[in-house]
Amino acid sequence: RKIPKVGHTFFQKPESCPPVPGGSMKLDIGIINENQRVSMSRNIESRSTSPWNYTVTWDPNRYPSEVVQAQCRNLGCINAQGKEDISMNSVPIQQETLVVRRKHQGCSVSFQLEKVLVTVGCTCVTPVIHHVQ
Amino acid sequence: RKIPKVGHTFFQKPESCPPVPGGSMKLDIGIINENQRVSMSRNIESRSTSPWNYTVTWDPNRYPSEVVQAQCRNLGCINAQGKEDISMNSVPIQQETLVVRRKHQGCSVSFQLEKVLVTVGCTCVTPVIHHVQ
């Protein structure tokens, strides 16, 4: 789902206040709900009728350093007999998420938010039929 | 997928540098790839064999202010005849994501990262547990 544009409001101080110096803000250390964990049903990526694989990208200057992307294994969906049914489509489910990018020059360290598109898994859909003229 | 714990490394300066004052860091204004957008297949939430609805939560002191949560509509999955197949299970696909929480007292504004669990959509799986005979 879409993250709306920041515009010029969220990270600004109220108009009556002096502007933020040097185009940066104060980010408190520590993460709220850091211990909260995804605990999805087991092995849904292989039990799904639209199964997927995971690829991990790793970047030490990003938080989280590890970003996991799903790729649908099939174009069609898997039927009860374990065969691919090409009358149905496996499609990716995407999500926009934020990560934090670390930038440093010597002892000067700053951080910036970055929007990342993550494919979280796949679902099986009835196709939209494109009639060929 | 899981966001690992920060530990005490990512947001710290190198050991040879003076510590960060007052437990806060410098966050640059602006978001990298802010214009990047999800472009999923149309209406997959209603075309899926494990369809879902969306619920929007809104909080002006959070970025993004709008967080969208999916809820699976059915316990089973929808078959080719549009009927529910109770031999299969609809299950939610979850993702940990970061949001930014704004805290202000008068003209003093600071920000903090928060981890949020988002249900992005649903997928149809072969059951592990046979509750229903």
Partner: nanobody, 123 residues
């Protein structure tokens, strides 16, 4: 933290009826389904019935099918279990709980249960 308060249990004769209620608070927005479970003395806790929050889609264990009906009141965040044609083997403590993964939810993954409500069916 999800909070669950079950009520409506009691002592009833064979063939009688009871209506159990479960008041739920603290559920996440994305909550998917609710279930009723039961545990008889010296037995494992078992699934009884489930209902989805949105569609009202329901499922029953084979041993209660046709006798028990699960329903929900979204406005009051309450789930009910109407129990008819009760049998002695229905004697147990009945619990409700969130089913975050629908019918894929494993009972051994629950961190929290309410106090339950005792149902006793006498012959």
């Amino acid at each position: 933290q999800v909070q669950l308060v079950e009520s409506g249990g009691g002592l009833v004769q064979v063939g009688g009826s009871l209506r159990l209620s479960c008041e739920v608070s603290g559920l996440p927005v994305s909550s998917y389904a609710m279930g009723w479970f039961r545990q008889a003395p010296e037995k494992e806790r078992e699934f009884v019935a489930a209902i989805s929050w949105i569609g009202g889609d329901s499922r029953y264990a084979h041993f209660v099918k046709g006798r028990f009906t699960i329903s929900r009141d979204n406005a009051k965040n309450t789930v009910h279990l109407q129990m008819d044609s009760l049998k002695p083997e229905d004697t147990a403590v009945y619990y409700c709980n969130d089913m975050p993964y629908g019918l894929d939810t494993r009972m051994d993954e629950y961190e929290y249960w309410g106090q339950g409500t005792q149902v006793t069916v006498s012959s």
